[in-house]
Interface confidence: low
Amino acid sequence: QEGKFSGPLKPMTFSIYEGQEPSQIIFQFKANPPAVTFELTGETDNIFVIEREGLLYYNRALDRETRSTHNLQVAALDANGIIVEGPVPITIKVKDINDNRPTFLQSKYEGSVRQNSRPGKPFLYVNATDLDDPATPNGQLYYQIVIQLPMINNVMYFQINNKTGAISLTREGSQELNPAKNPSYNLVISVKDMGGQSENSFSDTTSVDIIVTENIWKAPKPVEMVENSTDPHPIKITQVRWNDPGAQYSLVDKEKLPRFPFSIDQEGDIYVTQPLDREEKDAYVFYAVAKDEYGKPLSYPLEIHVKVKDINDNPPTCPSPVTVFEVQENERLGNSIGTLTAHDRDEENTANSFLNYRIVEQTPKLPMDGLFLIQTYAGMLQLAKQSLKKQDTPQYNLTIEVSDKDFKTLCFVQINVIDINDQIPIFEKSDYGNLTLAEDTNIGSTILTIQATDADEPFTGSSKILYHIIKGDSEGRLGVDTDPHTNTGYVIIKKPLDFETAAVSNIVFKAENPEPLVFGVKYNASSFAKFTLIVTDVNEAPQFSQHVFQAKVSEDVAIGTKVGNVTAKDPEGLDISYSLRGDTRGWLKIDHVTGEIFSVAPLDREAGSPYRVQVVATEVGGSSLSSVSEFHLILMDVNDNPPRLAKDYTGLFFCHPLSAPGSLIFEATDDDQHLFRGPHFTFSLGSGSLQNDWEVSKINGTHARLSTRHTEFEEREYVVLIRINDGGRPPLEGIVSLPVTFCSCVEGSCFRPAGHQTGIPTVGM
């Protein structure tokens, strides 16, 4: 069969499975005169043979793990043994079979994990090797936890990454592990080749002993600090401690106070830096943060609570320089004249702010002293001995001592004796007729003037008139302001008039005095007046129930999901049609009739959240008036962005030959939301075949170091694949490539002879 098993001498490649006894020839080379015989050289390993006539075969089973490629040369010789053709390269590629079992590098592993560690964050790696080809299932390893001891309530506290062997806590482990209850655990881990998918896979097991250590990164108890401390500052008030030394501590003032009187040192001790004033601020809440040397948070921040304890450092204060009360001539004994309300800035409902009232002087003392008394704790003044006569003494002045447990303050009260209120207010008109207004009349407009008079003593509470609308305006659309000099009442619009709900209103006013009428005198019809308000229709635009509508959905909701709804009403009762405006991303549609809003395309938080559009409500029919409101859609993050390199890393190079193993640092990022703690990426090599040459080690949640394992590199470009996992839910993995060039250097830079290829690396390591 010319061409498949025989033919002329030319470069050829053959693939042969390892471990199989020879069953057929490899190839029959045909000689072209003057060639008469063939010769085989190269990596024959005494396995490959060529007969003089050109028959190439092998005499025993191959082993890929000994040599995966045999580079042979075949030459054709003439009768004198001189090479007349060739030699040509013949490549034998040895194909892998699963003839090696995986083996753990250690029969026992030991590690420790801190309670409350983040679920999914590796704290220990087990590692197995398999001599078979990692590019085939034969060398693809699959790790599993066989058993966890002890197992409490059948709950797994630990998990393993099937591919990398990274052991981490489960969510339950993060919440429930407690060294006080159970300080140690044992795991039996198995590794299988064939990716764990075949019954014929080989396996190995190892034992992992895990110690659970206490997490001392805990919020301290709330602190109480007495205000106005005279001790030397700063004063230590509490402390936090990261689990390991070397953390960088800082405080975060979430309230953004103009004066933040706390500090933290690099031991984690928290201090108050100056005296506090409870009356300025009675409590502080701030956060303590621990960061690593790169400024990355090591864990969640701790909330620190400081309560400021009150001392009695404020005296009582009077409500005004002089407090004025009125009392009628005929008031009965015990009647209330008014209440003096003093203030104290110290803490409410404590002895520091509990006030006592006492009258220390009455002037004049006519017809006698002690005409008034004050309730000790309430501050209410009462008539104590007899009715007063204006013609004898029209005015009394009282000095009142107000005291807390340490301070005393004097307050002054003026009591005016006024004529008895025996005259009622009388309206000059009992009916103010009809008034017609459009429903869009401006708020604040005066629409009517009313007038009543009172014959009691002018400029006292007996003659002052207050107007009330007692009927016909349950919505409170109208109000009445009184001129204190003339007792004229001005009827004003306080809220918009509305033809649709109140086209005609029959309004009734009542005029009354702030002072009570004397016994036996009552308000009668003379103190009442009416008018009729007629409201005319104005076609109004629809009204939304809110200025801004807000909804919150996950960014991965299915297309067609209802994400929110808006509502508007037309004052005239017309139907409304809803539409959207400004949906620049084409994500939403609105039901014209119901106002329900649906997604019509995949949403993406990373494109911007909240997503803001306008909703328009338009009258159907009528004048087609419309109103606009805002709809804000807050998109909640899902882990839908794999990690990637934070910048372009082309141009990395090492000077060849390496004098010692070298390393370089790279940074990863992704576009998902990372709250206070930032991303927590894990890094590994992208394929098993890289492990002989390279090593990747995590520096922190975003940075890792790529190091060479030896110095024997060729002078060329290597593309190192790195696997970056974000540990999210679900975890996403990105495989990135770091191109690293090994090149001859001149003065620390890559040397390229003229005419060499472009793309000279620019970053030396």
């Epitope: 960088q248 790169y294 400024g295 934070a646 940074e667």
Partner: nanobody
């Protein structure tokens, strides 16, 4: 608003020296301070950087051994001592606050001119 204020520079003879200073209106924890420069018609390039603790300095290959970056009198100041100046050192020198190994610049100064010429 936080600002960076550079001073120093001017006209210098080849082989001569000058000193640039930069003061920030606030102190940055975990942020490094350093210098970049832009020669006429070229892109802005990294020159030198001092880590925020002041214990680690980095230099570009072109200035290594000639320039020294150091902390000023305060945590929020940085100096650049420039010796053995060459005409190719001519350009506008910018003070910057950077973060992390990627030297991502969070804040730029206004820049100060250095001209090396005889």
């Amino acid at each position: 608003q936080v600002q960076l204020q550079e001073s120093g520079g001017g006209l210098v003879q080849p082989g001569g020296s000058t000193r640039l200073s930069c003061v920030s209106s606030r102190t940055f924890s975990y942020y490094d301070m350093g210098w970049f420069r832009q020669a006429p018609g070229k892109e802005r390039e990294f020159v030198a950087l001092l880590s925020w603790r002041g214990n680690n300095a980095e230099y570009s290959d072109s200035v290594h051994g000639r320039f020294t970056v150091s902390r000023g009198n305060t945590q929020n100041s940085v100096n650049l001592q420039m010796n053995n100046l060459k005409p190719e050192d001519t350009g506008i020198y910018y003070c910057a606050v950077t973060y992390g190994v990627a030297r991502s610049v969070r804040l730029w100064g206004q820049g100060t001119q250095v001209t090396v010429s005889s």
